[in-house]
Amino acid sequence: TQNKALPENIKYGIVLDAGSSHTSLYIYKWPAEKENDTGVVHQVEECRVKGPGISKYVQKVNEIGIYLTDCMERAREVIPRSQHQETPVYLGATAGMRLLRMESEELADRVLDVVERSLSNYPFDFQGARIITGQEEGAYGWITINYLLGKFSQKTRWFSIVPYETNNQETFGALDLGGASTQITFVPQNQTTESPDNALQFRLYGKDYNVYTHSFLCYGKDQALWQKLAKDIQVASNEILRDPCFHPGYKKVVNVSDLYKTPCTKRFEMTLPFQQFEIQGIGNYQQCHQSVLELFNTSYCPYSQCAFNGIFLPPLQGDFGAFSAFYFVMNFLNLTSEKVSQEKVTEMMKKFCSQPWEEIKTSYAGVKEKYLSEYCFSGTYILSLLLQGYHFTADSWEHIHFIGKIQGSDAGWTLGYMLNLTNMIPAEQPLSTPLSHSTYV
């Protein structure tokens, strides 16, 4: 099938999401003559790169080429050879690399330089690798989900594409959770903002959007766990940390040097009388929740309303799509159903966290222990972040939709990023040519 003539002119694009815990490659395709229409671009492939995030390759940059090979070769197979040279490739690095750059611009540059050299060796049209800002990450995630939900389309459908799609043109807010940061982006009711840093203005398909966005660096699930451990070990009487966020019977040794490696734990750093400590799980949701809440400073707010850490947050408005780790964790815990109330989620979390580690390992034999051990913390963290961090309530919980894919495309910032860089989101509504939309309405 590699070199068969295509029945219609199809274009392709590749985006690599270089996250803090892993890298994923996404391949998108669309009909060339409809590239300014809304909703025509869709994902044809996701390839998860084997190994950690690129920021972990700082000590072994010579391995980056091999690390990227499998997924880049997969792209070579999926995209017809005749299209290779005109297929753009973009790599966006997120919070893991922001943290590395905070420690050392030289090391971040070195990693990106090697990544760029590696990606330039492929027959595609490589457009560069860069660290995207938290604001971009939030904005492009918001664009992605609303594009896929058809919110930018001016046509009124008589049917819904997805269960939670309403026929109105009200956009969805975007809640994104990664390993090192989390983003909240939505259109608030009040157009005026108290914090210009959190304000974005777009004109898309002939309509103006005043969007609020904020990226909380260090509040992704992995860095939040490091923060919690660094905070809790401060008051431990010896090198044993009895931790309510891990299952009863769970044990793990942590190196203090690993704990203080990240800038995220800087505020909790202290000289400890030991080089290692042992986490001993006690599996108590309520205590875990209390410990997590201590990561959110809600005592200081220079605005009318804040999320936490003095960051402005306008009143929540409308429905929200919660994706990436919000979805992965809640899906694992079987809590993504629209019918599950916030009270029920809390109840299930209490039950899950209190289950003995040996029992959990038996029940989920196919899951890597490193990931399996952290679901109690991650689930508790998600609840705390949404309820106490972002001020969702038991009532507004029903406005959160945990989304993995929409129409076969992953929810996340990559599609929005590519749409923007390929100029596929026009500011004005394109003039419809006869039958141009016949294929999908």
């Epitope: 700082v58 750059r101 905070m102 030289e106 090391l107 800038p263 995220c264 800087k266």
Partner: antibody
Framework: EVQLQQSGPELVKPGASVKMSCKAS????????MHWVKQSHGRTLEWIGY????????TFNQKFKGRATLTVNTSSRTAYMELRSLTSEDSAAYYC?????????WGQGTLVTVSA | DIVLTQSPASLAVSLGQRATISCRAS??????????MYWFQQKPGQPPNLLIY???NQGSGVPARFRGSGSGTDFSLNIHPMEADDTAMYFC?????????FGGGTKLEIK
Amino acid sequence: EVQLQQSGPELVKPGASVKMSCKASGYTFTDYNMHWVKQSHGRTLEWIGYIVPLNGGSTFNQKFKGRATLTVNTSSRTAYMELRSLTSEDSAAYYCARGGTRFAYWGQGTLVTVSA
Amino acid sequence: DIVLTQSPASLAVSLGQRATISCRASESVDNFGVSFMYWFQQKPGQPPNLLIYGASNQGSGVPARFRGSGSGTDFSLNIHPMEADDTAMYFCQQTKEVPYTFGGGTKLEIK
């Protein structure tokens, strides 16, 4: 365009304290550390320490530890340095500089004169 | 602490000629394949201005006549051809480990 705007000159008495500011613009304030550097006699440069604006954690040159305090106000994108128990040895220009390991952007400096 | 010894303390060079300033570290400032060595130019009444980072990379907007080289413990800054505007103080700095340290400075003048 990245800019660091520092507060004006200070004339202080020995034994007193001084608090200077550094207002940042043109970048995401919490994405970079803020360093402070002392320059005396127009020649000797000494690194005082840095703060992580993201969470307020700081690291100091042992020489200044206990006498210097670094703080930030993220909503106003401003970093502060307070120096206590001043002596004539502290008369110098003090600079803030943005960076992890690369000090690519510097404030214009705050001149501190300690005199009875 | 890593001590940086800069030499010479002062230097006078004719216009169009080459100026070479050296900086020796008391221990290697290399880590993960990167040299954490920097060169700054400072003119009276101004803050230091980054010329070279990572031992040999030119800072933003820095003219090509400023070249940095070296690795490990021995580094140098070369200015060629020397121009009148290059009269200034020059400092080396290491950020491999805390406390970050600076060299004593070199005063460069026109002969």
